[in-house]
């Protein structure tokens, strides 16, 4: 009885079960009653990361530079070439097909993760008793000054974008 | 052991036919494809044709040569393969041996062969 | 079909001898070739398969090698029961066929 179903890293075809090529070869024949599946190894720049029957390997990704991208990680016959951003730059997608400025956390916010080649800056509002004056990609959230340890009083209050102003205590009872 | 014995050759006239058999022992006969190659007095090898074992329906395969006039059937009850040859030509003469055809799709090979028997076809 | 074309069609040896045989294929057969040793009145016996594989209990003075289209059977050191016609077989495709013959003989 020919075959309905094949084994694991197996494909069925003209009621035979064939091996399936390992990964970093492609397909150049199908396998027969006699003769075993033929594969080829892909070449320098192509890679298959799957067993596979696929007739053609993938090219490697281009990291274009024009779109700020660069080598992270070689391809191989068998895995992809990874992508990153140049500094100050991040992916803007999974996929890093392309790259953009990180931004930078506004005034009443501080950096709460750094970006990196693939994330954005991640911001949070600065909670009371902290502040952010600066647009920055790097800058935390400072705590206001503290006017006691200085034996200063407060003479102005801070807010999420200014720190305290200190003054001198009052003398006069 | 792993045998084969041919039988049933002769002398017979064009356009005539003839049964030849090959017994098999020694080894579970229907799990195994089963060919029938010839050679021509002082010639090399020919291969005439193979049928299938159980797991593959018994069917059947020719050369170009015989297709038609040949039939290849095998009695697994028996352990015997037969070759039924009619219209018998001239060239058709030679040593007819049954060889067992072995191996898996890293290479498939005839791995035992019988004695051979001799078919001379002349009027 | 596939044409086996064997050479030489016979040589001359003496025990001891390296003989070297050549069978070169129509096509590329992909490894799918068998070696044969017929002596007279006998019957064929397979001595490789799949261009390097020696059956059982052939002697390793045998040995395959080849690819693609080419392939040849080295016997290293020739031994006297080694006279005999030797045959290549194509595997890869329906209908199989043969080489010529190599015929060793005792020079």
């Known amino acids: 009885e020919p075959p309905t179903a094949c084994r694991e890293k197996q494909y069925l075809i003209n009621s035979q079960c064939c091996s399936l090529c390992q990964p970093g070869q492609k397909l150049v024949s199908d396998c027969t009653e006699f003769t075993e599946t033929e594969c080829l190894p892909c070449s320098e720049s192509e890679f298959l990361d799957t067993w596979n029957r696929e007739t053609r390997c993938h090219q490697h990704k281009y990291c274009d530079p024009n779109l700020g991208l660069q080598v992270q990680q070689k391809g191989t016959s068998e895995t992809d070439t990874i992508c990153t951003c140049e500094e100050g730059l991040h992916c803007t997608s999974e996929s890093c097909e392309s790259c953009v400025p990180h931004r930078s956390c506004l005034p009443g916010f501080g950096v709460k993760q750094i970006a990196t080649g693939v994330s954005d800056t991640i911001c949070e509002p600065c909670p009371v008793g902290f502040f952010s004056n600066v647009s920055s990609a790097f800058e935390k959230c400072r705590p206001w000054t503290s006017c006691e340890t200085k034996d200063l009083v407060v003479q102005q209050a801070g807010t999420n974008k200014t720190d305290v102003v200190c003054g001198p205590q009052d003398r006069q009872r | 052991e792993v045998q084969l014995v041919e039988s049933g050759g002769g002398l017979v006239q064009p356009g005539g036919s003839l049964r030849l058999s090959c017994a098999a022992s020694?080894?579970?006969?229907?799990?195994?494809?089963m060919s029938w190659v010839r050679q021509a007095p002082g010639k090399g090898l020919e291969w005439v044709g193979f049928?299938?074992?159980?797991?593959?329906?018994?069917?059947?395969e020719y050369a170009a040569s015989v297709k038609g006039r040949f039939t290849i059937s095998r009695d697994n009850s028996k352990n015997t393969l037969y070759l039924q040859m009619n219209s018998l030509r001239a060239e058709d003469t030679a040593v007819y041996y049954c060889?067992?055809?072995?191996?898996?799709?890293?290479?498939?090979?005839?791995?035992?062969w019988g004695q051979g028997t001799l078919v001379t076809v002349s009027s | 079909d596939i044409q086996m074309t064997q050479s030489p069609s016979s040589l001359s040896a003496s025990v001891g001898d390296r003989v070297t045989i050549t069978c070169r294929a129509s096509?590329?057969?992909?490894?799918?070739l068998n070696w044969y040793q017929q002596k007279p009145g006998k019957a064929p016996k397979l001595l490789i398969y799949?261009?390097?594989r020696r059956d059982s209990g052939v002697p390793s003075r045998f040995s395959g090698s080849g690819s693609g289209t080419d392939y040849t059977l080295t016997i290293s050191s020739l031994q006297p029961e080694d006279f005999a016609t030797y045959f290549c077989q194509q595997g890869k495709t329906l209908p199989w066929t043969f080489g010529g013959g190599t015929k060793v003989e005792i020079k």
């Open positions: 799949y261009t390097s």
């Open positions: 060889a067992r055809y072995g191996g898996l799709r890293q290479g498939w090979y005839f791995d035992v």
């Open positions: 049928i299938r074992n159980k797991a593959n329906g018994y069917t059947t």
């Open positions: 096509q590329d057969i992909r490894n799918y």
């Open positions: 020694g080894f579970t006969f229907s799990d195994y494809y």
